[in-house]
């Protein structure tokens, strides 16, 4: 049999004008009771028990898991990153088969002065962290690399990696166009062959707050949304306190439903409250509060 | 680890001729290039030859004409006949060499370094 625990009652009605009687206590304050049979059935919205409690998925908490969260943890990357497959054909400098060996002496010193010319060509670039060559074939040395960005996570950094993205096609054209062989010599740390500059692809991070918070939300993904405070993104539904989105339930508890957030009225020993906000109150008649 | 060892120089009469010489360690660049560079006081430090192994010689336009690099893999020696001599070759010559075949006179270009030897050139 279930324990019975003394608590005192607070009438709550609903906007729709039902009343519910709730315990007045902490909802997270541990109930004990003692329990005979199986605890499974106990747990719902997917929960376990695990012996001592339930445990509850996300969006979920309580006793029985049967409460929906006001906020869900998301955690966007620290920093996010974009990769750039360009091709430069190197031309003060003669292909050979070592080349292809990336453990050679020849690559591993082909390797560091071409490091050593992007570092260069890109220095002015904050997002910038390196190069990476994949591949060297013939045409005097066509070069196939993977030029590395990396930015702090920000909602905007899209457009902060897309705009990096487009400053090292600049400076790869520009360098390509000026430090060309001249007399079949170069007098540059690297000579290219300008039409040889291309870029293959370019994989920006993909990360949205938007969609971890609506997937983590699951059945409540359309109530719950993203705000912004000093740059970190937080997943919240209306009844989460402080923000924008933030229902004000006045004289009443928000509380989450299938049908989104809605305002459970009190009712307290001189008035009851109404509405959908519960801001209209009535104060109950003098024989109604000695009843 | 490669080493590379120049001599050769001295002082000579403007038209004079000198003989320098750059000495490796071994063979390991006898399928890469190696160069001769030169550094003037207060100046900086410019390419003078390359020699690779596929036969490309290189030279500064300064030097055309009067200077040849050539080299003995037998001997893993670099030479650089100098002819001419003018003042202003007045410096000192630096061997350079690379596993890359290079057709960069830029010093950043190279990787391995020989001490120098002193040229100097009266009027």
């Known amino acids: 049999p279930l324990a019975t625990i003394p608590v005192s009652t607070t009438s709550l009605t609903s906007s729709e004008g039902s009343t519910i009687s709730t315990p007045s206590v902490d909802i997270s304050t541990p109930v004990t009771t003692s329990i005979v049979g199986d605890q499974c059935s106990r747990c719902k919205n997917g929960g376990f028990w695990d012996g001592l409690k339930c445990q509850c998925l996300t969006p979920y908490y309580g006793e029985s898991c049967e409460e929906v969260v006001n906020s869900i943890d998301i955690a966007p990357p620290e920093t996010v990153s974009a990769q750039m497959e360009l091709t430069v054909t190197v031309t003060s400098v003669k292909f050979t088969d070592e080349l292809k060996n990336h453990s050679s002496q020849e690559f591993r010193e082909f390797n560091k002065t071409f490091t050593e010319q992007m570092n260069i060509v890109y220095s002015g670039i904050p997002e910038y962290v390196g190069v990476n060559i994949t591949n060297l074939r013939l045409g005097s040395v066509v070069v196939e690399h993977d030029v590395l960005l990396r930015t702090k996570y920000t909602p905007e950094y899209k457009t902060a990696l897309d705009n990096a993205t487009e400053v090292v096609k600049q400076k790869i054209t520009k360098v390509t166009t000026e430090q060309i062989m001249t007399n079949d010599n170069c007098s540059a740390l690297m000579c290219f062959n300008t039409t040889g500059t291309q870029v293959q692809n370019i994989t920006v991070t993909q990360y949205d707050p938007v969609e971890e918070c609506r997937q983590k939300a699951e059945e409540y993904e359309d109530y719950f949304l993203v705000e912004y405070r000093d740059q970190k993104p937080y997943c919240i539904s209306p009844c989460e306190s402080g923000f924008n989105a933030s229902k004000n339930c006045n004289h009443g508890k928000c509380q989450m439903s299938q049908n989104g957030a809605r305002c459970l009225c009190v009712t307290t020993e001189t008035h009851w409250y109404s509405g959908e906000d519960c801001n209209q109150g009535t104060q109950k008649s003098h024989h109604h509060h000695h009843h | 680890d490669v080493q590379l060892q120049a001599s050769g120089g001295g002082s000579v009469q403007a038209g004079g001729s000198l003989r320098l010489s750059c000495a490796a360690s071994?063979?390991?660049?006898?399928?890469?290039?190696m160069s001769w560079f030169r550094q003037a006081p207060g100046k900086e430090r410019e390419g003078v030859a390359i020699?690779?192994?596929?036969?490309?010689?290189g030279y500064a336009d300064s030097v055309k004409g009067r200077f040849t690099i050539s080299q003995d893999n037998a001997k893993n020696t670099l030479y650089l006949q100098m002819i001419g001599l003018k003042p202003d070759d007045t410096a000192m010559y630096y061997c350079a060499a690379s596993f890359l075949v290079l057709r960069a006179l830029n010093p950043k270009a190279w990787h391995y370094w020989g001490q120098g030897t002193q040229v100097t050139v009266s009027s």
């Open positions: 020699i690779s192994s596929d036969g490309w010689t």
């Open positions: 071994d063979n390991t660049f006898s399928r890469g290039s």
